[in-house]
Interface confidence: medium
């Protein structure tokens, strides 16, 4: 018979034959031949390979590393690589999230719209009209003014992006 | 000096409470973001609250979020938990830590020597 010229799926075309390929999680130790079966076996702790191969080497699992503010999120497999995010308060420089930067705190004038996660930064937001932030925090959000009426006082001094409103008494006019 | 020093922690039965305190000195505590993290044994670090300078902003790990209450008093430059419906895997030393506002291998930049808190029954 004719030698093949292509092979079915999960199977790889070696001298002239097709043999199987190692499943996800085995590397390949030697080609089948005419009379035996594709060896293969399995990755080492460390290592994986994620797809039908004929890879001989596995790969490392990735390495979180401490230094670079990564701890592993997911444990890595046979089949699946290392999943690294990072530490509370820092999130991933990219998808790959191969290091990570310091979330960034909100200046004053500015609240938290959104508080940072592992995969993004701190989300800010301008205080409106009405509002404030008189501090630099990765927590604070805009806060509103006092409401000096519901406290049967005035406006002495009114408020801006930064800092509240000072509430005084009410002048109160003799006869 | 920076200093955060904790102090409450015990040994709780399971259902029980405790309340956590740290007294910080060294720095302007009322315009410092403020956490609690902990590690249980053989565990890493795990964060479990955050808070805002002015302690109007808290936020909580679901593992402990309607359990758990974080405050402060910028009067007094003191940090609190209050842990209540305590858990065994609440089991852990629980650290209070300074939000980082520098870069640096950790988003804490100073934190306390811990108190342990055991609940078991």
């Known amino acids: 018979p004719e030698p093949p010229t292509a092979c079915r799926e999960k199977q790889y075309l070696i001298n002239s034959q097709c043999c199987s390929l190692c499943q996800p999680g085995q590397k390949l130790v030697s080609d089948c031949t005419e009379f035996t079966e594709t060896e293969c076996l399995p990755c080492g702790e460390s290592e994986f390979l994620d797809t039908w191969n004929r890879e001989t080497h596995c790969h490392q699992h990735k390495y979180c590393d401490p230094n670079l503010g990564l701890r592993v999120q997911q444990k890595g497999t046979s089949e699946t690589d290392t999943i690294c995010t990072c530490e509370e308060g820092w999130h991933c420089t990219s998808e790959a999230c191969e290091s990570c930067v310091l979330h960034r705190s909100c200046s004053p004038g500015f609240g938290v719209k959104q508080i940072a996660t592992g995969v993004s930064d701190t989300i800010c937001e301008p205080c409106p009209v009405g509002f404030f932030s008189n501090v630099s925090s990765a927590f604070e959000k805009c806060h509103p003014w006092t409401s000096c009426e519901t406290k049967d006082l005035v406006v002495q001094q009114a408020g801006t992006n930064k800092t509240d409103v000072v509430c005084g008494p009410q002048d109160r006019l003799r006869a | 000096e920076v200093q955060l020093l904790e102090s409450g922690g015990g040994l709780v039965q399971p259902g029980g409470s405790l309340r956590l305190s740290c007294a910080a000195s060294g720095f302007t505590f009322n315009v410092a973001d403020m956490q609690w993290v902990r590690q249980a044994p053989g565990k890493g670090l795990e964060w479990v609250s955050s808070?805002?300078?002015?302690?109007?902003?808290?936020y909580y790990a679901d593992s402990v979020k309607g359990r758990f209450t974080i405050s402060r008093d910028n009067s007094k430059n003191t940090l609190y938990l209050q842990m209540n419906s305590l858990r065994a895997e609440d089991t852990a030393v629980y650290y209070c830590a300074k939000h980082a506002s520098t870069e640096g291998p950790t988003a804490f930049d100073y934190w306390g020597q811990g108190t342990l808190v055991t609940v078991s029954s």
């Open positions: 808070i805002s300078p002015n302690g109007w902003d808290t």
